[in-house]
Amino acid sequence: ATKLTEEKYELKEGQTLDVKCDYTLEKFASSQKAWQIIRDGEMPKTLACTERPSKNSHPVQVGRIILEDYHDHGLLRVRMVNLQVEDSGLYQCVIYQPPKEPHMLFDRIRLVVTKGFSGTPGSNENSTQNVYKIPPTTTKALCPLYTSPRTVTQAPPKSTADVSTPDSEINLTNVTDIIRVPVFN
């Protein structure tokens, strides 16, 4: 069995989680990728997916989650912006390869989000004044919804597609460095 390892990210509310999931370039470059949360005593939930087939360095935004798949580097970049305490939990990157079972990418991500320091705004010496601007994106066929033997690679019906706000843009301030601590189960 694959040894499950965790990488711990400790961040404050309002900051951004920025992780990179590596994958085998030749095998999975155009495969659809997903970001899942695994909560104790719950079924996992797929929160967001890249398009199908996955487009190179094309940002897909679902709520506060932004996925970017860099084919030439063999990595999926996942950002969760404006973090909230309730975002704390265990996450993982997944590659869909129908009709085979999804391929889980390790390490899993243990995200711990705590309340920011009280006091003067901007007094945190670690904070940097970063602003992310995500270009407006319309995303189709975000996650595999209906797969049958005849339509494994077919996009789901139009009515089930997620469409982001046409003029959506995310501006972030006070994005601090990420603390990465490997944790082994």
Epitope: I37, C49, E101, T147
Partner: antibody, heavy 122, light 113 residues
């Protein structure tokens, strides 16, 4: 066209066992989480159990925990519910239902079987 | 457990009129990270299994008439039938699949006035 067909219901005495089956067709069964939901006569819907697409995750309602077991055979496109130590309050129509999205991309259950009636009575 | 409370228990509406059903969850069913509410609406006609109408609180399932719409976020949700048709007579249920155990509202019976 997706079809879910339940079978195995019937009349059984309290304390006895019953095994329900749900045969699926028209979908890649092994990609979907599956649920059992029941409905007592004239009552509302009650979730019973869920199993993940690969069988690795299983969860139960407190009312059936320790008595019912959900399982699946992806090679046969079939979902099962083993019901032991049956009680009168387990009397209901039992439905199997498929999650709308594959691989945990779920909200809502898109396809339901017609149901099979389980009557627990002495 | 998340308790789902539906109101009213029953509703009589004239053909062509609007029907509104409310559903309240005892805690939020919104995943704020992906901005999705894990709430669905079902229609059940006598002797039939439930049929999915709305998922993620406001997205209509494929093939469902556009007179059905869902709205709300967090803990308060509404199913609206904009112009009631005879074939809409049924019991309607809300359901959360945000967290286990998954729970349903008690149902709202919609009839023709």
């Amino acid at each position: 066209q997706v079809q879910l067909v339940e079978s195995g219901g019937g009349v059984v005495q309290p304390g006895r066992s019953l095994r329900l089956s749900c045969a699926a067709s028209g979908l890649t069964f092994s990609s979907y989480g599956m649920h059992w939901v029941r409905q007592a006569p004239g009552k509302g819907l009650e979730w019973v159990a869920v199993i993940s697409y690969d069988g690795s995750n299983k969860y139960y309602a407190d009312s059936v925990k320790g008595r019912f077991t959900i399982s699946r055979d992806n090679s046969k496109n079939t979902l099962y519910l083993q019901m032991n130590s049956l009680r009168a309050e387990d009397t209901a129509v039992y439905y199997c239902a498929r999650e709308r999205g594959t691989y945990y991309y779920a909200s809502g259950w898109a396809n339901w079987g017609q149901g099979t009636l389980v009557t627990v009575s002495s | 457990d998340i308790v789902m409370t539906q109101s009213p228990d029953s509703l009589a509406v004239s053909l062509g009129e609007r029907a509104t059903i409310n559903c309240k969850s005892s805690q939020s069913v919104l995943f704020s990270s992906n901005n999705k509410n894990y709430l669905a609406w079902y229609q059940q006609k006598p002797g039939q299994p439930p049929k999915l109408l709305i998922y993620w609180a406001s997205t209509r399932e494929s093939g469902v008439p556009d007179r059905f719409s869902g709205s709300g976020s967090g803990t308060d949700f509404t199913l609206t039938i904009s112009s009631l048709q005879a074939e809409d007579v049924a019991v309607y249920y809300c359901q959360q699949d945000f967290s286990l155990p998954y729970t349903f509202g008690g149902g709202t019976k919609v009839e023709i006035k």
